[in-house]
Amino acid sequence: APSCPQNVNISGGTFTLSHGWAPGSLLTYSCPQGLYPSPASRLCKSSGQWQTPGATRSLSKAVCKPVRCPAPVSFENGIYTPRLGSYPVGGNVSFECEDGFILRGSPVRQCRPNGMWDGETAVCDNGAGHCPNPGISLGAVRTGFRFGHGDKVRYRCSSNLVLTGSSERECQGNGVWSGTEPICRQPYSYDFPEDVAPALGTSFSHMLGATNPTQKTKESLGRKIQIQRSGHLNLYLLLDCSQSVSENDFLIFKESASLMVDRIFSFEINVSVAIITFASEPKVLMSVLNDNSRDMTEVISSLENANYKDHENGTGTNTYAALNSVYLMMNNQMRLLGMETMAWQEIRHAIILLTDGKSNMGGSPKTAVDHIREILNINQKRNDYLDIYAIGVGKLDVDWRELNELGSKKDGERHAFILQDTKALHQVFEHMLDVSKLTDTICGVGNMSANASDQERTPWHVTIKPKSQETCRGALISDQWVLTAAHCFRDGNDHSLWRVNVGDPKSQWGKEFLIEKAVISPGFDVFAKKNQGILEFYGDDIALLKLAQKVKMSTHARPICLPCTMEANLALRRPQGSTCRDHENELLNKQSVPAHFVALNGSKLNINLKMGVEWTSCAEVVSQEKTMFPNLTDVREVVTDQFLCSGTQEDESPCKGESGGAVFLERRFRFFQVGLVSWGLYNPCLGSADKNSRKRAPRSKVPPPRDFHINLFRMQPWLRQHLGDVLNFLPL
């Protein structure tokens, strides 16, 4: 058979051959960082000629070209500089907002050597919509400018850029956009392993219901996770074995898959693993229907026995057939277990597709994905039951559009990636799920099902009792620390008689803990401004209690996520370099932010935290309170910027005994504490018969109700000082 000519050098770069100079061999070019090869690859045809995939004209000289990042096509309500057609590696673009708009995202972004911008999409938002302004990523064009419930926005990419993420997003009832943020990227761009590992790991961990790879305490290392979610996980590993994958690359695919299997079996969950290799046809090496699929050693040995030569007779890339074999496996399992049974319906399915190129036979893989979604009944309610991760390796002939089409679209998560080479893939799987660091103190998880008890819905919620009577509330922020209000402690330093009542699945009355130490903010002094006619002042109204023993985590006792920590960062599914300011911008991102606190009877009540100009008008009514503040000239003397304000319109007001309790928000089905209940102008419980009776203030009440909550974003130095060894704080 003729061999292909050897005059294929690339100036400034190197090349590798999958099968020497023989027909069927794939030649892959590579360039130093910051440059990309054009063309990326050539295929040796049976005629003995090189062919460039996708090329229409005759063979051109291969060159290394400089990588560039896409320019903004449009930037709303602000300006960006400098204005270039595209940006060189290392080049910056800066964003500023017009008056009345707040910048969310990164004010300055740098073009990275992989053709991707660092940071996050900059958005100038005024918080007016039901959903935050979804922004326009660099290189994209958006149609749709209304952000109300049910409104849709559509995206496309300019010129030859490729869209990854969702081309259409809808503003949902919970104030969050459906799908995942669209990004426009150069066709030659790829992902760095250090970006992929946390993104993939976070998404995967979220699916497992266990996300806290950040505990510092030594005893948590090596401890296994008790996953709180019921049910079973089916993991399907699909390994591309087509002609363009060299034998060495296939070995790394296998090794990466083994790493994944090893990690996944370290979780205390019921898991079955399927192994499928594919080229022109799929070969099922392990089926989830086989009992051995639950046994780690059996799964790994079937992976080790996967042979590169199994597919030498059919060397195309039939991704459709590979995914269809997953569909057939699901279909058989459904028939076996019964379509209507919980045993079938409670199985979560994760598909990891490792490929090096586009499918070139067997029809559209999207069709197989549609069949899979259909058989699993994937809809908004059951979205959590399927995750498809499409990972392209070797940027040669990987089709971004196809990968993006196959990967799941979930808010704040990424499921489609392209890595430069198999070494990068290995790195990703090595760092993706470092089980040794995972613990079961996952934060901010509450049971949202209709039949859950109040304590299961807010398992961080605790009651503080000085003697026999309850006096204040608080929130577990770790397995041994409670955050509450300083004004609850007015008896000097003797807390020996105090008790903290924590939720306990074994008792409806909870479990009582003694306090090892109380750390009360030294800045708190209710009489600090008495001389100014301010009879009560609640600045620095914050305290921490260290419990005498650790709380055993359960459905009834679990910490809430504190913003500005790595634990919260994982729960928000934000990138690794996020800061405290990013958390504030994400959580308190509107003029009126819906939030909650827990009532004396344990139920969750609704409030709206007023921000920006609305904060000012919310706080202003304090000037009408003549008893507590007889000669107040400046409201800010009483309501400093340490406070969040609520109590307008239909808001519930907290009672005195609800002081110290968490003021929290829900994001991505997780809960984040942004404040703690401090003081107010109206007590709806005063003189009531019991914990279930609350009286709404009459509309004519002067002053009208207002409630003030310590803003945790303003207490960061103090929190860091005392919790630095307990939580992992992000940079401010």
Epitope: P466, K467, S468, Q469, E470, T471, C472, R490, D491, V526, F527, L535, E536, L600, T627, M628, C655, K656, G657, S659, N683, C685, L686, G687, S688, A689, D690, K691
Partner: nanobody, 122 residues
Framework: QVQLVESGGGLVQPGGSLRLSCAAS????????MGWFRQAPGKEREFVSS????????EYADSVKGRFTISRDNSKNTVYLQMNSLRAEDTAVYYC???????????????WGQGTLVTVSS
């Protein structure tokens, strides 16, 4: 727990005034919200007034607002209720109560006085 003893009740004509006192024993008096409740014959016990542990904020039932004034003297461990412009419907046994949280939930209060009778009649 705080022990409470009320005094100052009696018979008074409509439009008249009375000052009720409530003496508390226990060194933690200054940490407690203090309040007054009343119970008319055949009726439920109802909230009248309360004062915060700091003395800085006070609350009144709508029916007594502008006529009654609550105050406290932490040095004497005593809380007072000054009642002016008394009406026949103010006739009741007046009880003093102490509450650490300040909500004065009837189901949770465990510090009550024995009560002092106020009769408003001509």
């Amino acid at each position: 727990q705080v022990q409470l003893v009320e005094s100052g009740g009696g018979l008074v004509q409509p439009g008249g005034s009375l000052r009720l006192s409530c003496a508390a024993s226990g060194h933690t008096f200054r940490s407690y919200y203090m309040g007054w409740f009343r119970q008319a014959p055949g009726k439920e016990r109802e909230f009248v007034s309360s004062i915060s542990w700091t003395g800085g904020s006070t609350e009144y039932a709508d029916s007594v607002k502008g006529r009654f004034t609550i105050s406290r003297d932490n040095s004497k461990n005593t809380v007072y209720l000054q009642m002016n412009s008394l009406r026949a419907e103010d006739t009741a046994v007046y009880y003093c109560a102490a509450d650490y949280s300040g909500d004065f939930l009837l189901s949770d209060l465990d510090s009550w006085g024995q009560g002092t009778l106020v009769t408003v009649s001509s």
